[in-house]
């Protein structure tokens, strides 16, 4: 066969679906690799072909679209399972071709099992809710396109294993779940089960997501440098190790990049000749506020180093701050026998 543009195995799109549930999988070519959509390709006389490689096999084989009740079918650029089976797991390829053009991509599909409490190896999306922020909603994800708008499904929401009914601050509202005032106690896994009829059969879609309650932007502050501060002086003798921690508190801010860095005499440590190491550690509070500590270390400090300016800087979406460390050279204690004795007139 003639050459085909092979985009390889697209592991970025590791698709996971539940066993015994419908699944609709769009060919990734049109979403991520080609600059035209399926309709354009179809109009231009291109054909979309599907095949797969079973788990632990090397042999590519065509997909059987003649299974009872059309269990697997294709509609435009979508591969349908009604429903999936465990042994549908494998690498699926969609290929777009005609006599002069060919492009294909493969992607892994994993059919996973769940228990009666919806626990499974499925990677769960995380939805962040602001603590004590007023009404916030989560929506049952990835259910578009499974049934027409004329079909009215039933939706049941669960927190962990428990059906959500008569919860204090969590109210199911169809495809949405409303949190009146989100609290830390609302952290957990939430599952919506969507049940709908199709051609005399009943299908279930199970979608689980993790809710994480985070700090509210209403309470967010610019970075706060706890150390260095005015109360601590780093007094060292030449030859000693100088250790200065820069400890910064960052409020949680959605999509904010928190940065901490040192400057020595106005330059980044990488841009100066002295032997400096910087070690960073990060810790988080329950609401994902962040404390970053960068310890600046000079193993054998010189008297020149003790005259330098050491400034800790921090930046977030809320602002930028800087604090200088108070560094000075320790005045050596007088040696009694010589220096004090001289004061008493001894020779």
């Amino acid at each position: 066969s003639e050459r085909c543009d092979d985009w390889g195995l697209d592991t970025m799109r590791q698709i996971q679906v539940f066993e015994d549930e419908p699944a609709r999988i769009k060919c990734p070519l049109f979403e991520h690799f080609l600059k035209f959509n399926y309709s354009t390709a179809h109009s231009a006389g291109l054909t979309l072909i599907w095949y797969w490689t079973r788990q632990d096999r090397d042999l590519e084989e065509p997909i059987n679209f003649r299974l009872p009740e059309n269990r697997i079918s294709k509609e435009k650029d979508v591969l349908w399972f009604r429903p999936t089976l465990l042994n549908d797991t494998g690498n699926y390829t969609c290929m777009l071709r005609n006599t002069t053009y060919c492009s294909k991509v493969a992607f892994p599909l994993e059919v996973v099992q769940k228990d009666s409490c919806f626990n499974s190896p499925m990677k769960l999306p995380v939805h962040k809710l602001y603590i004590e922020y007023g009404i916030q909603r989560i929506t049952c994800p990835n259910v578009d396109g499974y049934f027409p708008s004329s079909v009215k499904p039933t939706i049941t929401w669960y927190m962990g294993c428990y059906k959500i009914q008569n919860f204090n601050n969590v109210i199911p509202e169809g495809m949405n779940l409303s949190f009146l005032i989100a609290l830390i106690s609302n952290n957990g896994n939430y599952t919506c089960v969507v049940t709908y009829p199709e051609n005399g059969r009943t299908f279930h879609l199970t979608r689980t997501l993790t809710v994480k309650v985070v700090g509210s932007p209403k309470n967010a502050v610019p970075p706060v440098i706890h150390s260095p501060n005015d109360h601590v002086v780093y007094e060292k003798e030449p030859g000693e190790e100088l250790l200065i921690p820069c400890t910064v508190y960052f409020s949680f801010l959605m999509d904010s990049r928190n940065e901490v860095w040192w400057t020595i005499d106005g330059k980044k440590p990488d841009d100066i000749t002295i032997d400096v190491t910087i070690n960073e550690s990060i810790s988080h509070s329950r609401t994902e506020d962040e404390t970053r500590t960068q310890i600046l270390s000079i193993k054998k400090v010189t008297s020149e180093d003790l005259k330098r300016s050491y400034v800790c800087h921090a930046r977030s979406a809320k602002g930028e701050v800087a604090k200088a460390a108070k560094v000075k050279q320790k005045v050596p204690a007088p040696r009694y026998t010589v220096e004090l004795a001289c004061g008493f007139g001894a020779t």
Partner: antibody, heavy 118, light 112 residues
């Protein structure tokens, strides 16, 4: 440029209603508190209240609760301070200010002078 | 309500000399996250107030480094290392521990 532009000076009679405005620009209006501050002639600053335009969460100073209404319209990036029935003692300069975090009112409007006199 | 008390209420200063304003709150302003919810503002004659210091000790953008804030809990100080003529005006501290913010009564700084 981040700025807050307030509506112009007002001269009113006691008992009349009034709504003054504060329009934000150059930043995400829904992501910062907007506060209102009163300064009576020759006096100091008094904090009246704040609003979070994102969801209209409003907090008032006990001294101003029930006396004024703070509101916001995020579609036009504008906060409002409203009186139903003005009194002579409402004569003052009213400032709006953006709080950048914690309290930190880092951007202030130019002030709106309200004069209430019969 | 948290009451903020400033002293002195009037501060005559000599250009080039240091100056210091004290602010005391009726309860601790130390937040559980380790910062103090206290700001300092300056209102120059005929102007809107401007932020000088936030969270107790952080200089606001564009504020000269002769201004510094210190203190924790209930006692705070604003220092001007060398007063300049343009520093005259009313200085206010403001607390924001609760969402009932309150200003101090103000300190008038004027040139001797």
């Amino acid at each position: 440029e981040v700025q807050l532009v307030q509506s112009g000076a007002e001269v009113k009679k006691p008992g009349e209603s009034l709504k003054i405005s504060c329009k934000g620009s150059g930043y995400s209006f829904t992501s910062y508190w907007i506060g209102w501050v009163r300064q009576m002639p020759g006096k100091g600053l008094e904090w009246m209240g704040i609003i979070w335009p994102g969801d209209s969460d409003t907090r008032y100073s006990p001294s101003f609760q029930g006396q004024v209404t703070i509101s916001a319209d995020k579609s036009v990036n504008t906060a409002y301070l409203q009186w139903i029935s003005l009194k002579a003692s409402d004569t003052a300069i009213y400032y709006c200010a953006r709080s950048s975090g914690g309290t930190a009112m880092d951007v202030w409007g130019q002030g709106t002078t309200v004069t209430v006199s019969s | 309500d948290i009451v903020m008390t400033q002293s002195p209420l009037s501060l005559p200063v000599t250009p080039g000399e240091p100056a210091s304003i004290s602010c005391r709150s009726s309860q601790s302003l130390l937040h559980s996250n380790g910062y103090n919810t206290l700001d300092w503002y300056l209102q120059k004659p005929g102007q809107s107030p401007q932020l000088l210091i936030y969270l107790g000790s952080n200089r606001a953008s564009g504020v000269p480094d002769r201004f510094s804030g210190s203190g924790s809990g209930t006692d705070f100080t604003l220092k001007i290392s060398r007063v300049e003529a343009e520093d005259v005006g009313l200085y206010y501290c403001m607390q924001g521990l609760q969402t009932q913010w309150t200003f101090g009564q103000g300190t008038r700084v004027e040139i001797k």
